[in-house]
């Protein structure tokens, strides 16, 4: 029996994927029942991808580090809608880097994931970035104009966002 | 835990063939994608290849392309770098990288993206 296989097929790799993440939250995606998209409990999901907003307080490479353990990156914004969604999971009071520096301080600003950097699609503050020597990228609030990214030292330890690729069983 | 050993390097003459081997001494090394890097005297590491779970999908560097590729096999926790008609600048340590990765078509360039490292092995192209 087809549905049979796939279940079984299903569990196995829930299963698997257990010694990663303890548990995952899966959807039916469209009319398929062969298609179930999932995150990692607690993670949220936006379109394709899962986010986690990590509370620990650690420096850019570490923060990067945590996130390329449980098979995600730093998180690299690609439009305004994906911005709009992530902030909804933020504190206002806090500040989160984002997969975004410019390790040699020449302003030659990359994303972990080697997306390219888009002058278009960019959500500096005013006046951002400001320091040679502030080399990698946070996401904070700013009363006079909302959420938007600054420059800060990468030792320096904030939160985090990780993102990945929605996990399809 | 993932522990990675590299193996296979030496030297060679220019032209010449050698195969890079980088076994995971792990349990779920299909769960992982696979990522060579280089490192020349006094420069940063640089990426190779990169090979996905499933080793369905590949990259290269634009230097290695059509000289260099990269393979695995899951059931000997094992991924090869294969590398034809070698250059004097191909001379650095080599390294494997290892990273989890849901997805079976997924490969990854960034050294940042890799927490799980070899400890390299030396190859040097010189006549």
């Known amino acids: 029996n087809f549905m049979y296989s796939k279940t079984v097929k299903r569990l196995s790799k829930l299963r698997e994927y257990q010694q990663y993440h303890p548990s995952l939250t899966c959807v039916m995606e469209g009319k398929d029942i062969e298609d179930w998209s999932c995150c990692p409990t607690p993670w949220t999901s936006f379109q394709s991808s899962c986010y986690f907003i990590s509370t620990g307080m650690q420096s850019w490479t570490k923060s990067q580090k945590n996130c390329s353990v449980m098979g995600a990156d730093l998180v690299v914004i690609n439009t305004r809608e994906e911005q709009d969604f992530i902030i909804q999971n933020l504190k206002r009071n806090s500040s989160y880097f984002l997969g975004l520096s410019d390790p040699g301080g020449r302003r030659h600003w990359q994303w972990v994931d080697q997306t390219p950097y888009n002058e278009n699609v960019t959500f500096w503050h005013s006046g951002e970035p400001n320091n040679l020597d502030e080399r990698c990228a946070i996401i904070n609030f700013r009363s006079s104009e909302e959420w938007g990214w600054n420059d800060i030292h990468c030792h320096v330890p904030q939160k985090s966002i990780c993102k990945m690729k929605k996990i399809y069983i | 835990q993932v522990q990675l050993q590299e193996s296979g390097g030496g030297l060679v003459q220019p032209g010449d063939s050698l195969t890079l081997s980088c076994a995971d001494s792990?349990?779920?090394?299909?769960?992982?994608?696979m990522g060579w890097f280089h490192q020349a005297p006094g420069k940063e590491r640089e990426f190779v290849a990169a090979?996905?779970?499933?080793?369905?999908?590949?990259a290269y560097a634009d230097s290695v392309k059509g000289r260099f590729t990269i393979s695995r096999d899951n059931a000997k926790n094992t991924v090869y770098l294969q590398m034809n008609n070698l250059k004097p600048e191909d001379t650095a340590v080599y390294y494997c990288?290892?990273?989890?990765?849901?997805?079976?078509?997924?490969?990854?360039?960034?050294?940042?993206?890799?927490?799980?490292w070899g400890q390299g092995t030396q190859v040097t192209v010189s006549s």
């Open positions: 990288a290892a990273r989890l990765s849901f997805s079976g078509s997924s490969y990854y360039q960034g050294p940042l993206q890799y927490p799980y």
């Open positions: 792990g349990r779920t090394f299909s769960n992982y994608a």
């Open positions: 090979i996905s779970t499933s080793g369905g999908s590949t």
